[in-house]
């Protein structure tokens, strides 16, 4: 018979002849010949591999370093890597969470809703009407404009979101 | 060169006080966010308080919360962490941070033991 050109899928091609892929979880020990099955092995303890494949070598687990406030969220298996977050105030740098920071900050005219955990961001909301915040922060929430009138005086100028009103002494009427 | 020196740490029994402060030096102390952060023998990193620039908002984890007290005084460029009510679990190296502080700038920390 001719020779397959294609195989099924989770199958591979090799030697003019097609063998099954290794399911997740185990690694290529050698292929099918005429008359064997492709040999497989499960991976090791901290090992994984999460599809059907032909590989020789698991992929070693992502470890979540302490040292860069990386905590395990979700062990690995045989057939999925580990999954790393950040210590409770820190927030992944990117997807895959190699690495934290501190609470990511407000922008000046925003203020923080929500501060950061180890699985969610800042949140941050726009300082409405009457309120500000000057500063980019983790920290800071919006703030009432200061009352002018409490203190007997008049505003000189009004706020904005990002900057608070200034105050000035009342026009005194001449006599 | 940005500097952070934490001191005011010690030996103290459970139930006890202490004051920590971190002095900041090399960059604008009053427009950052600051942070303390603990690290336990053998454990990982833990954020415990932090500050907004001008102070008025602070944050705290909640295994420290309505026992820690975090402050700032601009003037000085010095940050403080009042620490009331020790318990044995907050033993620990405590760290200042700056702002989002990508581990990069940190101190040696001071060491704050709590035993009987």
């Known amino acids: 018979p001719e020779p397959p050109t294609a195989c099924r899928e989770k199958q591979y091609l090799i030697n003019s002849q097609c063998c099954s892929l290794c399911q997740p979880g185990q690694k290529l020990v050698s292929d099918c010949t005429e008359f064997t099955e492709t040999e497989c092995l499960p991976c090791g303890e901290s090992e994984f591999l999460d599809t059907w494949n032909r590989e020789t070598h698991c992929h070693q687990h992502k470890y979540c370093d302490p040292n860069l406030g990386l905590r395990v969220q979700q062990k690995g298996t045989s057939e999925t890597d580990t999954i790393c977050t950040c210590e409770e105030g820190w927030h992944c740098t990117s997807e895959a969470c190699e690495s934290c920071v501190l609470h990511r900050s407000c922008s000046p005219g925003f203020g923080v809703k929500q501060i950061a955990t180890g699985v969610s961001d800042t949140i941050c909301e726009p300082c409405p009407v009457g309120f500000f915040s000057n500063v980019s922060s983790a920290f800071e929430k919006c703030h009432p404009w200061t009352s002018c009138e409490t203190k007997d005086l008049v505003v000189q100028q009004a706020g904005t979101n990002k900057t608070d009103v200034v105050c000035g002494p009342q026009d005194r009427l001449r006599a | 060169e940005v500097q952070l020196l934490e001191s005011g740490g010690g030996l103290v029994q459970p139930g006890g006080s202490l004051r920590l402060s971190c002095a900041a030096s090399?960059?604008?102390?009053?427009?950052?966010?600051m942070s303390w952060v603990r690290q336990a023998p053998g454990k990982g990193l833990e954020w415990v308080s932090g500050?907004?620039?001008?102070?008025?908002?602070?944050y705290y984890a909640d295994s420290v919360k309505g026992r820690f007290t975090i402050s700032r005084d601009n003037s000085k460029n010095t940050l403080y962490l009042q620490m009331n009510s020790l318990r044995a679990e907050d033993t620990a190296v405590y760290y200042c941070?700056?702002?989002?502080?990508?581990?990069?700038?940190w101190g040696q920390g001071t060491l704050v033991t709590v035993s009987s």
């Open positions: 090399g960059f604008t102390f009053e427009s950052q966010d």
């Open positions: 500050i907004s620039p001008n102070g008025w908002d602070t």
């Open positions: 941070a700056k702002d989002r502080s990508d581990f990069d700038y």
